[in-house]
């Protein structure tokens, strides 16, 4: 329950006052304001927007609003030497070239500084060779190609369709397969929903539309030149050869009109099965190379982008807590966009702006939160979560001691069907209780709660009558807070119906067509879904910052730990003979989970009964709750991924966007049957079980009575 007793304010200043102050019309106005020109990281336009937000947050009433700048590695196309891909004939003449830019959307033809589609951090190069189609370029796609079809990608240019996994993983997989270049394209099967028109007449991707994006494999490092430390004025920078996560082969994205021209000539092997076919009128042959008549033609890439150390700016706003100013609840989302950012990120930034305005209104009326709330407008998220990571690196000692929670606020919508939440299990009960108090914006659910519509449309696969809440993965600014620092984190947005729309993300993601009009005409004309997301994000922040006892339930962690232990055990049990041979046992892990469950249960009982008027005991209990997430951090990190330190969750090694549970054990078991030294491989499995069991047990003990 919300309580304001400790802040000596009138009862009207409660959660209801905060929520009632949030207005859809304001979010709409802010979105319009943030999307009229591009705000690419490292540009003057984005610096000006940072200063505008700083000024407005001050006007809204925050105690202080500062810019925090860093000099990080960014990547841009060469303005006079454009990137493109050619089909060349045997004489080397270019007989077809891919597009140099997207056709601008209506009304934006005269806008300057629209960055053309490119793969950020691609090295320069002009490789030429035969094409191999590699489906989504997932780990399993390369297994199919190399192991089953005996197709060698070494020295080839591969073409992969966007979707299913983070593009950086696709590039990493292609590199490991020996490819000398990568072409990424958007297939209509993934980015064109049936029965919907393409932009500007609907929300589908036109043939000339292209998805931009970075292709790094940072594994949480932040700025590639200063891993672990802030990219400040006195930073020591690595040489480019030692930079973290940079791709080694040229990469370039294209739309499906251009992809058609490359794929229609493909020869070689037929696709292995229907899952390798998209929706273009092409055979989806794998190659290598073009079919008979065109067998002498090759593909050539022309990539001239440059990596440059560039200044970026975060905006950090503070609303000081009245009772526990040294406890921080953080609401953060990015400001930089690839082009106009109609959805990503400005649908989120507009919501943050309105949340700040509402909190500021309450503060001007004499209210303060119990704990300090920090608001952040991050820069350079699109270039690898750089702004948030550098700021967290600079402030890591404060954050690890004082960080209560981080709520992420990127895109508020990726559809308009139902709510989507990913968060730590500590926040499950907070999210459930909050959504039961909010009205559903959905058609057919008038007068019903958000919890009810969400549960109906997105039911939990395990617990009937409850909604699905997913694991946190990565690909957004919560990464450093959760995966590196162990600060309880969550995110919420409105999403599509995953049952009927099997395309990846939303069709116009990272294209020039992600405009204000896209949102206002097709996704949320009344901005009612934006308002609901503002209520969820803002409501979570309000409760985390204001409730006397932190709204974390450690028993929910116990439940998922058992589920994850069962899951990883069943994966291991696919190799019963080896488990016997190498004496692999999960007993220690299950024992630790059992202990955690019992201790969490007892802690919860004490939490109900303790004297909340005793500030020392209250602070002690709250600290045990705050530090529980921290207790899952292994200071040594995961193997070869030192900045992913959470033992229970990490981004999947095969898809940065997805979360994996017990990632150390999972990765040790992955493809273990193909390892050349089984004894060593199973030894690593045993070591990872040991690390996981120890960590769960150690975390449990932080919840025990202190003396």
């Amino acid at each position: 329950k919300s309580s304001n007793e400790a802040t000596n304010i009138t009862p009207k200043h409660n959660m209801k006052a905060f929520l009632d102050e949030l207005k859809a019309e304001n979010i709409k106005k802010f979105l319009y304001n943030f999307t009229q020109i591009p705000h690419l990281a490292g540009t003057e336009q984005n610096f000006q927007l940072a200063k505008q937000i700083q000024s407005q947050w001050k006007e809204f009433g925050l105690d202080s609003v500062e810019l925090a700048h860093y000099d990080v590695l960014l990547s841009y196309p060469n303005k006079t030497h454009p990137n493109y891909i050619s089909i060349i004939n045997e004489d080397g003449n270019e007989i077809f070239n891919t597009s140099l830019f997207e056709p601008p959307p209506p009304g934006y033809e005269n806008v300057s500084d629209i960055v053309p589609p490119f793969s950020a951090f691609s090295p320069q190069g002009m490789p030429e060779g035969d094409l191999v189609y590699v489906n989504y370029a997932r780990t399993e796609d390369f297994f199919k190609l190399e192991r089953d079809m005996k197709i060698n990608c070494s020295g080839k240019i591969v073409i992969a369709r966007y979707g299913k996994v983070f593009r950086g993983n696709k590039v990493k997989n292609a590199q490991l397969a020996g490819a000398k270049g990568v072409i990424l394209y958007s297939d209509p099967a993934d980015y064109f929903a049936p029965g919907v028109k393409s932009y500007p007449d609907g929300w589908n991707l036109p043939g000339g539309g292209v998805q931009r994006g970075n292709i790094l494999n940072l594994n949480g490092a932040g700025d590639p030149l200063t891993p672990g430390y802030p990219a400040n004025e006195y930073a020591y920078r690595r040489g480019i050869a030692e930079a973290v996560g940079l791709p080694s082969i040229p990469v370039h994205p294209i739309g499906y009109y251009d992809a058609q021209k490359l794929l229609e000539k493909m020869g070689g092997s037929a696709p292995p099965d229907s899952s390798w076919r998209g929706s273009l009128k092409v055979p989806y042959n794998v190659g290598p190379g073009f079919t008979g008549n065109f067998s002498t033609q090759k593909v050539k890439m022309h990539i001239h982008s440059t990596n440059e150390v560039t200044r970026i700016y975060n905006v950090i706003g503070t609303l000081r807590g009245a009772v526990e100013p040294d406890r921080y609840v953080i609401l953060g989302g990015h400001r930089d966009s690839w082009v106009f950012g109609g959805i990503d990120p400005q649908s989120g930034a507009a919501v943050v702006h309105e949340i700040v305005r509402s909190f500021g209104t309450l503060k001007k009326e004499g209210w303060r939160p119990r704990r300090t709330i920090l608001f952040a407008s991050w820069d350079a998220e699109e270039f690898g979560l750089l702004g948030s990571t550098e700021w967290a690196e600079e402030n890591s000692r404060l954050l690890q001691e004082r960080g209560v929670a981080y709520i992420n606020a990127d895109s508020s919508i990726e559809g308009n069907y139902t709510l989507r939440v990913d968060c730590t299990p500590l926040m499950y009960s907070l999210v459930h209780n909050l959504t039961k108090e909010l009205k559903s914006p959905d058609e057919g659910f008038e007068g019903k709660s958000l919890y009810e519509s969400w549960t109906k449309k997105s039911p939990s696969p395990e617990f009937s009558g409850m909604p699905r809440i997913s694991k946190l993965g990565s690909g957004n600014d919560f990464e450093v807070f959760f995966q590196r620092l162990g600060i309880a984190s969550g995110r919420a947005r409105y999403t599509k119906n995953w049952e009927t729309n099997k395309f990846s993300g939303y069709p116009l993601y990272h294209s020039v067509y992600e405009t204000y009009e896209l949102v206002e005409k097709f996704y949320d004309p009344m901005f009612k879904y934006h308002l609901t997301v503002a209520q969820v994000r803002g409501g979570m922040v309000f409760e985390l910052a204001n409730s006397i006892v932190l709204p974390f339930d450690c028993r929910d962690y116990a439940v998922v730990l058992r589920k994850y232990a069962d899951k990883i055990y069943s994966i291991s049990m696919k190799h019963p003979q080896e488990m016997k041979t190498y004496s692999v046992s999960f007993d220690s892990l299950f024992s630790a989970v059992k202990n955690f469950t019992e201790i969490a249960s007892k802690f919860s009982e004490r939490l109900q009964d303790f004297d909340k008027s005793n500030p020392i005991v209250l602070r002690m209990m709250n600290d045990q709750l705050m530090f529980l997430e921290r207790a899952f951090i292994d200071p040594l990190g995961l193997p070869d991924r030192p900045f992913y330190r959470h033992v229970i969750y990490a981004p999947s090694s095969h898809n940065k966007y997805a979360g994996e549970s017990f990632p150390g054990i999972y990765d040790a078991l992955f493809d273990i049957e193909s390892k050349v030294d089984p004894s060593k491989a199973w030894g690593e499995v045993k070591r990872q079980i040991y690390v996981a069991a120890f960590t769960v047990q150690a975390a449990a003990e932080t919840l025990s009575e202190v003396a």
Epitope: F96, S99, E102, P103, P104, E109, Y257, D258, K261
Partner: nanobody, 123 residues
Framework: QVQLVESGGGVVQPGRSLRLSCAAS????????MHWVRQAPGKGLEWVAF????????YYADAVKGRFTISRDNSKNTLYLQMNSLRAEDTAVYYC????????????????WGQGTMVTVSS
Amino acid sequence: QVQLVESGGGVVQPGRSLRLSCAASGFPLISYGMHWVRQAPGKGLEWVAFQTYDASNRYYADAVKGRFTISRDNSKNTLYLQMNSLRAEDTAVYYCARDRIVGGRVPDAFDIWGQGTMVTVSS
């Protein structure tokens, strides 16, 4: 109102050059592939050249390849056809036309065309 207006035609001697212009209004040239098409006296329409919206690709009829160059100035919303080494058989009314596919990569059908400008190649 969407329209195309050609200009620059006239009488020219064989072997000489001429540059045709096509001013677009009511729509942004920057989003569309554009064609030049011609019709010789008493003959049917003959496609001449096509350029993609971003000028990354140009396609020409065999009869004009190496002599004609299609180009555009998106800031002026104008399409051009530079005609060199003109021949008597190039005599025709020249029309510019908009490709119907926004962002199209290859010549498709046209949806809008101008009133044409006459080019006469004669000694």
